[in-house]
């Protein structure tokens, strides 16, 4: 049953809370099985997804799994939005689901959480088994 | 050989908890793109999706039924558990574990045999 | 939610004959990344569901190429070539674009 079709993971709705000022990875997990696509990363701006074409990116690979990450370095807050990475395969567009940056901005500490909204809220602790950042589901 | 099974309790009392655990073999769920999630069927009624849980711990509810339910997965033992609090006797069912496979996006592509839930004091 | 219509909701069918189920969706199920998730299941007496058709027209591993599936957008059609007796069950289209993820109410096919 294994295909060898490209597939990128990234899941509908997902989310990621973010600090403005601290550094971020983006990952686009991609499987595929002999030659690399070509995967790029876009904002989605309405209906249009715009690509990032001068923004840092980078390959991680793991044996089963590649990871084609879009840096912030640092995040910025208008960096706040949903993003989405498409791979070219043979010819084929491969496109992700998008997912959503929220950017809290530091200079707003009111806006970040309260303890008691992390306790009603644990998934904001989630940390993401590849990086040290939060994951808000 | 992929399989899922269901285990839990048969009879159930209005008010009580359901513990149901979904117990599966030939793949893993730290797999990316793989999930699991618990469907039910009540007696000669259409199927009802209920939650799924993802490879990297993430978790989808029905929202008609999200504050009675939470699932849990543990990847060492292969099993996925849900648990729905406050049963009534419409909540009787055939409750089933579906594996989600992955083309974009999640699809049900194995299924368990199924364990009928009976709500009744 | 999304809610997913079949019809017949009954359809004796004689062996050998085709075969044809309509499911229809209230939303477009045609997702942002450009692909449809609408995937039909067949549930034999007494069986659990079994997987037939994903992203609309794609043959689950296993499953008979008498087996079908097409449409785009809202409107969904299952069809069986030449209906043979293990074929009789009920069938269900589920829809995976949106949240929650729904089933149709399930298409019982009958021999003549």
């Known amino acids: 049953k294994e295909s060898c079709d490209v597939q990128l993971y990234i899941k509908r709705q997902s989310e990621h809370s973010i600090l403005a000022g601290d550094p971020f990875e983006l990952e686009c997990p991609v499987k595929y099985c002999a030659n690399r696509p070509h995967v790029t990363w876009c904002k989605l701006n309405g209906t249009t997804c715009v690509k990032l074409e001068d923004r840092q990116t980078s390959w991680k690979e793991e044996k089963n799994i590649s990871f084609f990450i879009l840096h912030f370095e640092p995040v910025l807050p208008n960096d706040n939005g949903s993003y989405r990475c498409s791979a070219n395969f043979q010819s084929n567009l491969i496109e992700s689901h998008s997912t959503t940056l929220y950017v809290t901005d530091v200079k707003s500490a009111s806006e970040r959480p309260s303890k008691d909204e992390m306790a009603s809220r644990p998934w904001l602790l989630y940390r993401h088994h590849h990086h040290h950042h939060h994951h808000h589901h | 050989q992929i399989t899922l099974k269901e285990s839990g309790p048969t009879l159930v009392k209005p008010t009580q908890t359901l513990t149901l655990t979904c117990t599966f073999s030939g793949f893993s769920l730290s797999t990316f793109g793989m999930g699991v999630s618990w469907i039910r069927q009540p007696p000669g009624k259409a199927l009802e999706w209920l939650a799924h849980i993802y490879w990297d711990d993430d978790k989808r509810f029905n929202p008609s039924l999200k504050s009675r339910l939470t699932i849990t997965k543990d990847t060492s033992k292969n099993q996925v558990v849900l648990t729905m609090t406050n049963m009534d006797p419409v909540d009787t069912a055939t409750y089933y574990c579906a594996r989600g496979n992955w083309d974009g996006e999640t699809y049900f592509d194995y299924w368990g045999q199924g364990t009928l839930v009976t709500v009744s004091s | 939610d999304v809610v997913m219509t079949q019809s017949p909701l009954s359809l004796p069918v004689t062996l050998g004959q085709p075969a044809s189920i309509s499911c229809k969706s209230t939303?477009?199920?045609?997702?942002?990344?450009?692909?449809?998730?609408l995937n039909w299941f067949q549930q034999r007496p007494g069986q659990s569901p079994r997987s037939l058709i994903y992203?609309?027209?794609k043959l689950d591993s296993g499953v008979p190429d008498r087996f079908s599936g097409s449409g785009s957008g809202t409107d969904f059609t299952l069809k069986i070539s030449r209906v043979e007796a293990e074929d009789v069950g009920v069938y269900y289209c589920w829809q995976g674009t949106h949240f929650p993820w729904t089933f149709g109410q399930g298409t019982k096919v009958e021999i003549k």
């Open positions: 992203l609309v027209s």
């Open positions: 939303q477009s199920l045609l997702d942002s990344d450009g692909k449809t998730y």
